[in-house]
Every structure is written in C-alpha cells, then in structure tokens.
C-alpha cells in the first residue's frame, strides 16, 4: 500500500506529510491505524493534524505506529499510510543507520548538503550544522537557506552532517535535528563564464512563412558537474512562459557532454507555422551560471 517511513527523536518536533498528496483545497482526515481513532485538528493537542501534515509537538516514543490519511476531493477518496518511528535520544555522538537520511555526494566544485525534511517546518535561518557532532566553524562552511555549502571540498570532508533548527508553532519553539552522510567524489571539474556555441551573436536565420523552424541555444559552462547552469530563450526580453503564443514552445534543456569533458546544455525553441509577426521579434539565447549571464541575439528573416 501507499506508505512512507518517517522517523524522529523523542522531545523533538516531527512533522509528517501524507504520502498521498492532493491539491491544497482537498480535505485530509488522519487516523491512528491501530485504533482507527481520529487525530484531532485542534492545535492545543500535542499530536494534531493540519491538512496534509501530521504534527508531533514534541514527539514521544509511544507515538510510534502507523497513521492513515484519507485525502478527499469532490469525487475521489485516496488513502495513504505514514509509518512513524520515534527513537530515544542517543547518549553518545554515534548516529545509528536507522536515523540517517539519504547519502549525498559532492565534489570540489559542487558541495551542497540539503537539510532533510526542513521544508515541512516553520523555521528561520540560520541553520546550525555539525559534522560528527562537532559544530562547524570557519569560512569554508556557509549555511545558506536550507543547505550547507563547503568551499574547496577535500576527501576528509566526508562524514555524517547534522542540521539543527527550531520549528515555531504558535509562539512555541521545538528543536529538530536531521543527519545524512556526505561522500566526496574525486572530480577534477571547473566552471567558466558561459560560452554560447550557437547561435552566433546578432545572427539572422532565414525561414519560410508557414513552415516550422527550430532555434537551438547551446552553451558550455566548464567541465564536470555544474552547480548552476541554465540555458533558455527569451522573446523581446520576456520569458517564453510569459509569451502566450502556443505556436512557440521551448523544450527542456538537454545536457550534453563532449569528448573533451565540457558540460554543455542545449535548449530548442520550436516555432510552428512561422508567421510574419515572428520576424519582428527579438530572440535571445541566454546562458547563466554562477559566473554570470551571456546573451546572444538572433532574428528571423524571410527566405
């Protein structure tokens, strides 16, 4: 059945989302499966339901068990199961495997560690980060929004990283911790200011009225995995999505890796049934990464 494992530590906040997600307007009823007893929605209770979320503020070991959520739309009722386990706090620094979230990998140029499940909570920056129970200090470590960035990652940065934050509910504060392993890949990658391979700047492309045409925006950003690399088209300085012309559609960017190891992205703009007014538009190919933005412009002309 449609179920999801969730876990937490006693005396910490735990918030669980119904594995059966629906639109925000749908009603969600929660039950404790063993007794079929309804979970209250009143916030004065230590355990209460709030739409798609089930909140343990704070959690107790006795809360462990299977919880049923039923999401009700006008025409469909869908059931999910949350398998919740609350563990006693560990006396030592060791974090057992059953409390670990998924492992993430990083490299010298890409070392983001996201704090697991944090999006479920009402928290305010900054996050506290620990490695093997030691608070992280020094300029190499940057707590940014919901993730940690490590500069100049080295192999000995591998280990278990714990994020700690405070969840606020109606003026009351609850502590939350989450731990995941970080491994380091030996990758000699680098990133450069974007280089647009196509189209050439101020290029003109000849097209036939009434025919279909494709424009390819192709840019390279360096070597190896890239932290941020986007390639997109704009029409007269506007996003394609803001330009309500169904004949003109942008394909999702396709990653490409050449034999020389360059990391490149291609994004195709498809124009169906080319019209006269399309010749008046300015088509901008935009390539963006952490170094900055490069723009090449192309126009269409009649064959």
């Amino acid at each position: 059945k449609f179920s999801k494992q969730s876990w937490g530590l006693e005396n910490e906040a735990l918030i669980v989302r119904c594995p059966r997600q629906g639109k925000s307007s749908y009603i969600v009823d929660w039950y404790y499966s063993q007794t079929n007893k309804s979970i209250p929605t009143q916030e004065r209770n230590r355990v209460f339901a709030s739409g798609q979320l089930l909140k343990f503020l704070p959690a107790e070991v006795a809360d462990s068990g299977i919880y049923t959520c039923i999401v009700r739309s006008p025409t469909f009722n869908r059931t999910g199961y949350a398998n919740v386990t609350i563990y006693k706090k560990q006396p030592d620094c060791n974090v057992p495997d059953y409390l670990m979230y998924s492992t993430v990998s990083g490299s010298e140029k890409n070392s983001k560690i996201y704090c697991p499940t944090i999006d479920l909570y009402n928290w305010t920056a900054p996050l506290e980060w620990f490695k093997n129970c030691q608070a992280l200090q020094g300029s190499r470590y940057k707590a940014h929004k919901s993730f940690l960035v490590i500069d100049n990652v080295m192999t000995d940065d591998a280990g278990d990283y714990t994020c700690k934050f405070i969840h606020n509910e109606n003026g009351a504060n609850y502590s939350v911790t989450a731990t995941r392993s970080f491994t380091v890949k030996d990758e000699q990658g680098f990133s450069l200011f974007p280089v647009i391979r196509a189209p050439a700047h101020n290029e003109t492309k000849e097209v036939e009225i009434g025919e279909n045409t494709n424009l390819t925006c192709s840019a390279c950003f360096g070597k190896g995995a890239q932290f941020l690399a986007t390639v997109q088209w704009q029409l007269n300085g506007n996003k394609i999505t803001d330009f309500s012309e169904p004949r003109i559609q942008q394909e999702e960017g396709q990653n490409q890796s050449f034999s020389n190891g360059l990391a490149c992205v291609n994004t195709v703009l498809r124009i169906a049934d080319v019209k006269e007014e399309d010749l008046l538009l300015r088509y901008d190919c935009l390539a963006l990464n952490l170094h900055g933005l490069r723009r090449h412009t192309i126009r269409l002309s009649r064959k």
Partner: antibody
C-alpha cells in the same frame, strides 16, 4: 457537466504538421493536468503527452519527443497538441483527457475523456 | 518504463457469469493502478482507481484488488453492457502506461 471536445484531426502527408485542440468546459480547467492519449486503429491506448495545470511542466512519450508540443491556454480553456514531422505510425484517434488530481510531478487517473479526433498520416 | 501485461487477451463468457481479468506490472506500482472500460467507437471510461476503489457511478459488480505487481479486476455477474475491452493503467511514475487490453466477449 465536464465536457472535452477535440478538433483539428484529418488526413496529412508524412512529414506534415497538424494542430489538435481540445475545448474544455464544466470544471476549473486551470488547476487540472491535461493529457493526450492516442489509439491506433484496432490497437490499445498509448499515452502521448501531458501538461500540468499552470503549463509549467510538460511530459512526452519517447515516440513523440521533439516532434510534438503540448500547450494550453487557460484563458480560453483550451488544450493543444502541435504535431510536426508526422509519420505513418502516428495514425490514431487522439483523445484529450483530464487528470483531476495530479500534483506537481505526479499523475493520477483520467476521469473524463473527449470523443477523440482521428489523425491519418498517409501519402 | 513500467510494462503492464494483461491476461487473458480474450475472455469468452455468458451474461451472469463471473469475469476475472489480470494485470501484471514489470515492477511494483504500489496501488497506483486503474482500470478502464472501452466499448467500440467510444472513449475509455474509468472504473477503478488506486487498485480497489470504484469511481463515482460505477456499479458494485465491478471490484479491483491487488498491490505491488499483481492486480485483478472482477466483474461478479456479467451484464450485457459489460462486454467490452478493459485496460489497466499505472500512474506511479512517468511515463504512465497502459496494458494491451483484455476483450470480454459474449460466448
């Protein structure tokens, strides 16, 4: 009452283009994901493409990727399928259908279907 | 891509008999599986969602069961209007896929 009405089908030569439309009524079009599903003569159902309610995410079957483009105009309650570089194997009845549940990146069932429009690709 | 295999391809039965249709997935789809009925010249009609829940307006003689990879659609007592083609569909992930169909015909 939910209604979906496809149009735009017809006979087209291989390599040609066609644009299908699906006019929707009887529900809040802008919040539901919409699908195109096709059925070749005497064959089973094949998912072609889908688009989320706000048009922000589109999905395609491998067999049509790069040739077909799904889009929607929520102000007109209309779903589109632009079909380019058509092949004989694209010959089918094309149905538009509603996914009444799907949330971002997930799918559900198709509870309402149009009557279908026939696309024939032949020289 | 998850492949759904339906069996049998054709089921020849008389009105009043019980029909049992099978759908097997190439990997687990939890209970993210639906059944549709299609009559000649018509669009498919949703019967069952989430493996075992009847859609609005579907008669109680239709029932679904199963979870993971093996699913069954049962029609407890066939009515004349039930003779049609039945498809299963999974929606656990993209792309959604359909089975090849089972035709229930009059014996």
């Amino acid at each position: 009452e939910v209604q979906l009405l496809e149009s735009g089908g017809g006979l087209v030569q291989p390599g040609g283009s066609l644009r299908l439309s699906c006019a929707a009524s009887g529900f809040t079009f802008s919040v539901d994901s919409m699908f195109w599903v096709r059925q070749a003569p005497g064959k089973g159902l094949e998912w072609v493409s889908s688009i989320e309610g706000n048009g922000g995410a589109t999905y395609y079957a491998d067999s049509v990727k790069g040739r077909f483009t799904i889009s929607r105009d929520n102000s007109k309650n209309t779903l589109y399928l632009q079909m380019n570089s058509l092949r004989a194997e694209d010959t089918a009845v094309y149905y538009c259908a509603r996914d009444p549940w799907s949330t971002e990146g997930s799918f559900f069932v198709l509870d309402y279907w149009g009557q279908g429009t026939l696309v024939t690709v032949s020289s | 891509e998850i492949v759904l295999t339906q069996s049998p391809a054709t089921l020849s039965l008389s009105p009043g008999e019980r029909a049992t249709l099978s759908c097997r997935a190439s990997q687990s789809v939890d209970d993210d599986l639906a059944w549709y009925q299609q009559k000649p010249g018509q669009a498919p009609r949703l019967l069952i969602y989430d493996a075992s829940n009847r859609a609005t307006g579907i008669p109680a003689r239709f029932s679904g069961s199963g979870s993971g990879t093996d699913f069954t659609l049962t029609i407890s007592s066939l009515e004349p209007e039930d003779f049609a083609v039945y498809y299963c569909q999974q929606y656990i992930g993209a792309p959604i896929t359909f089975g090849q169909g089972t035709k229930v015909e009059i014996k």
